[in-house]
């Protein structure tokens, strides 16, 4: 529990401290206070760097002091022989003695009290962006008129965030434009259009004047556009350095304007509008798109028709065409569907004949039926040659999809009859 | 076959053997057998065999047996109470529809049907081949296939021959243009047991082929002249019957 004051004594004080001890004390005063630690008695075996016996004062990771030997006060009106002032509310005191003492040493007596710290002046880093106000046990920040204190209770800024723009066209400017924008502010503007429309931002060079970058090229004040995982900027300087037309490919755009404490300029003004999301004209082999356009945008519907001999297979069913819609994400629906060569499948068997085994059963492939000669012949003509047609059928020039018919050859004996002379 | 020679089934791959009654037939396509009406009038479910030269029981077991689905007798064939006393063999033609198609090969293949043109009108002296397992000079039934080549003769030659064992007056026997008379040379003739077999004539338009000009029907006396059903006169009936009783697989 934090305390406002306390006493720390070496073991057995005021008797001699024992050999081989290590003891530590964790001092904690309330938040917002520092610690004043002072020693009124110090009698510890002296050694170089206090290597044998010592009392150590540690604040966080820093060693504030290491004491040994005998000390007496320099001031006859004060009993303090050594003192430490830390602007933190925690401190650790560690006492160590080694295995032997040449003489009898009585150790130390120390006291601590909680002291007020002036957060506004005692630290290198100023805690407030504008006005700092100290009080016992703490401080608070305050802001000039027109500014408000941010949630971090340290920084002041102007109220320039939270605007959401949903209209398909609009104009956005930095606070006070064309008067100088406020320092130390983060302005966030959100453009949220209907899905299927991309935000297009247009800026004129002369409508942009933001504190220039430092010598390392880092913008001190910056304008950034964020669309999903894509970022445009940061931009700064006199005259807009980016593209005058920014196609975000997104229906959602966040505009972030960040300023530091110094160097305010007139700021910026931009226009935006919503363009229907374009879909790229994809290369779909063996097909034609209807209607044919130079550019396709959100909600456009095309019929993709396969060329003769090609089909789109969906769920193991073949079709000659399919519809694709330009979606809100700039991608085509049914984009996985492709026109592939028609497969006529394994040719049917015929009675008393055979079909040569096809090397391929795809569009354009050719097969030949033959009859079991010399006992059968092809009755219905056509020559027996079939090709895989665009409709998925094996087709003959003469018979169409009708299969050849192998019928018996009649009236031909395998061996002629010879009368035996008697 | 009287006065014939031994033959091999490869000489007559269309030859069909009927075992009851002992007779013949001609295969005309995968599903149909052409025979004489008098062969099937008494047995509408005949057992038939193809592809074997010998009709020995052991050989038949290895040959192809044909199962009939239906027998179609020509509507002009007069059915009698006592077929043995028949004197009218007009329209002696029938078709047997098979249950299953016959697989063709060197020992089984059909004979052609005559065309309808005048090219297929027979002239006296035109030669035809007959084959069968019927009576020979030596035995009642042949075990191995016999065949003979004989000429077409004028119908009067058949009329002039005295019927050997008449069952009626000689004048009672009917002779019509639906019959072909053939034989009379070297005693070569068809006989009992050869009925229904083809009288095969060389196709006038394709010398490599034979067509069934006639079917062994009847005769006054074995070894003289014989009468054969004139198939040309029945081609329309044959085609119509086959068409009306075919399966889609044949169409």
């Amino acid at each position: 529990e934090p305390t406002m004051y306390g006493e720390i004594l070496s073991p057995n004080y005021p008797q001699a401290y024992p050999s081989e001890v290590e003891k530590s004390w964790d001092i904690e005063v309330p938040e917002g206070y520092g610690i004043h630690l002072y020693f009124t008695h110090l009698d510890i075996e002296l050694s170089e760097n206090c290597a044998y016996d010592s009392v150590q004062i540690i604040s966080g990771d820093t060693e504030e002091g290491r004491l040994c030997g005998q000390r007496s006060s320099n001031n006859p009106h004060s009993p303090i022989v050594e003192e430490f002032q830390v602007p933190y509310n925690k401190l650790q005191v560690i006492f160590k003695s080694d295995f032997s003492n040449e003489e009898r040493f009585t150790g130390f007596a120390a006291y601590y009290v909680a002291t007020d710290i002036n957060e506004c002046t005692d630290f290198v880093d100023v805690p407030c962006s504008h006005f700092c106000n100290n009080f016992i046990g703490g401080y608070f920040c305050s802001c000039p008129p027109e500014y408000f204190l941010h949630d971090d209770m340290k920084n002041c800024g102007v109220n320039c965030s939270g605007d959401v723009f949903t209209a398909l066209i609009g104009e956005i400017a930095s606070p006070n434009y064309p008067k100088p924008y406020p320092e130390n502010s983060r302005c966030e503007y959100q453009i949220r259009l209907e899905k299927g429309f991309q935000v297009v931002v247009t800026l004129r060079r002369e409508d942009f004047d933001v504190e220039a970058a430092d010598s390392a090229g880092n913008c001190l004040d910056s304008l950034v556009f964020v669309a999903g995982d894509r970022q445009f900027g940061p931009y700064c300087g006199h005259g807009f350095p980016g593209p005058l037309n920014i196609e975000t490919k997104s229906n959602a755009l966040d505009i972030i304007f960040q300023t530091d404490l110094t160097g305010q300029k007139k700021g910026w003004k931009l226009r935006y509008h919503g363009d229907p999301m374009p879909c790229p004209k994809e290369d779909t082999p063996n097909s034609v798109w209807e209607p044919a356009k130079a550019k396709y945008v959100f909600r456009d519907v095309v019929q993709i028709t396969c060329l003769d001999g090609f089909e789109v297979v969906e769920g193991r069913v073949g079709a000659t065409s399919f519809y694709s819609t330009c979606q809100s994400n700039g991608k085509w629906s049914n984009s996985k569907l492709k026109c592939q060569p028609v497969d006529c499948g394994i040719p049917e068997s015929i009675e008393n004949g055979k079909v040569e085994d096809p090397e391929s059963t795809l569009f354009g492939s050719v097969i030949r039926y033959t009859c079991e000669e010399p006992y059968y012949y092809m009755e219905n003509g056509g020559g027996g040659e079939y090709h895989c047609a665009g409709n998925g059928s094996w087709v003959n020039e003469v018979l169409g999809p009708e299969l050849p018919k192998c019928v018996p050859v009649c009236g031909v004996p395998r061996e002629p009859f010879e009368e035996k002379q008697r | 076959i009287i006065g014939g020679s031994d033959a091999d089934i490869k000489n007559f791959p269309w030859q069909v053997f009927f075992d009851n009654p002992w007779a013949g037939g001609a295969l005309i396509n995968e599903y149909w057998v052409l025979t004489a009406a008098h062969v099937v009038e008494g047995n509408r479910e005949p057992t038939m065999y193809v592809g074997s030269t010998s009709v020995q029981t052991s050989r038949l077991a290895k040959s192809k047996m044909l199962t009939p689905e239906h027998v179609f007798i020509h509507p002009g064939w007069k059915l009698l109470e006592v077929p043995e006393g028949r004197t009218n063999f007009d329209n002696d033609i029938a078709l047997v529809r098979l249950k299953d198609p016959v697989k063709m090969g060197p020992t089984v293949s059909p004979i052609c049907l005559p065309g309808t043109s005048s090219d297929y009108n027979l002239m006296d002296g035109d030669l035809g081949l007959i084959s069968g397992w019927g009576r020979t000079e030596k035995r009642d039934r042949a075990v191995r296939l016999k065949a003979a080549r004989l000429p077409v003769a004028p119908l009067r030659k058949c009329k002039e021959v005295k019927v050997e064992k008449p069952t009626a007056d000689a004048e009672a026997y009917v002779f019509t243009p639906n019959m072909i008379c053939a034989g009379g040379e070297k005693g070569m003739d068809s006989c009992k047991g050869d009925s229904g077999g083809a009288f095969a004539v060389q196709d006038p338009n394709d010398k490599t082929k034979f067509y069934a000009a006639g079917l062994v029907s009847w005769g006054p006396q074995c070894g003289t002249y014989g009468l054969y059903t004139r198939v040309k006169n029945y081609v329309d009936w044959i085609m119509k019957t086959m068409q009306e009783n075919s399966t889609p697989r044949e169409d």
Epitope: V317, G345, P347, E348, S349, K354, E356, D357, P358 | P248
Partner: antibody
């Protein structure tokens, strides 16, 4: 007479392999495309694979595509089904069938039983 | 893939009655490639009707088939004791897979 006789079935553990054979007779085997069809106990028919007459073109059911291979040896008038990585759901009576007009299966074997169980 | 649905799953009728078995395809099937099979317990299936309406060899004329597009029917005009069996419809489509219906069991009432 057309005859198809399957063999090679039996009991096999999951992950195991079997090779089914189908001996054909009574027709010119090399003239016909052939198929394997299976029937799980008490269930309906399920097509498994098809092979063209010469064996160059095959189609297999998606669920067995990587595991089963249909093949044929026309010199031996025999159809085969090599089954690897067998699963319990492959348990069935496997029939071979001849494909005829319009890919109707006009002749079937009597079937061979494959049981996949640990 | 084309799914074939047969109805009813079981049909209970008496000999002499008329039987109507239905097969419905999930998408249009060519009537040339729609076939029916008969299967009796413990036996292999037999091709019964091919290309929608053609009776296979040995199938009695009391059987008939009809249909087009997605709806197909097998009809038995007057049931005989030997007709009680399971009937499967089957379609072939070049893109595969070949599919069968789940079967209709025709049983004696």
């Amino acid at each position: 007479e057309v005859m198809l006789v399957e063999s090679g079935g039996g009991l096999v553990k999951p992950g195991g392999s079997l090779r089914l054979s189908c001996a054909a007779s009574g027709f010119t085997f090399s003239n016909y495309a052939m198929s394997w069809v299976r029937q799980a106990p008490g269930k309906g028919l399920e097509w498994v694979a098809t092979i063209s007459s010469g064996g160059s073109k095959t189609y297999e059911l998606d669920s067995v595509d990587e595991r089963f291979t249909i093949s044929r040896d026309n010199s031996k008038d025999t159809l085969y089904l090599q089954m690897n990585s067998l699963r319990a759901e492959d348990t069935a009576l496997y029939y071979c069938a001849r494909l005829f007009t319009k890919h109707a299966m006009d002749y079937w074997g009597q079937g061979t039983l494959v049981t996949v169980s640990s | 893939q084309i799914v074939l649905t047969q109805s009813p799953a079981t049909l209970s009728l008496s000999p002499g009655e008329r039987a109507t078995l239905s097969c419905t395809a999930s998408s249009s099937v060519s009537s040339s490639y729609l076939h029916w099979y008969q299967q009796k317990p413990g036996k292999a299936p037999k091709l019964w009707i091919y290309s929608t309406s053609n009776l296979a060899s040995g199938v009695p004329s009391r059987f008939s088939g009809s249909g087009s597009g997605t709806d197909y029917t097998l009809t038995i005009s007057s049931l005989q004791p030997e007709d009680f069996a399971t009937y499967y419809c089957h379609q072939y489509y070049r893109l595969h897979p070949i599919t069968f219906g789940q079967g209709t069991k025709l049983e004696i009432k």
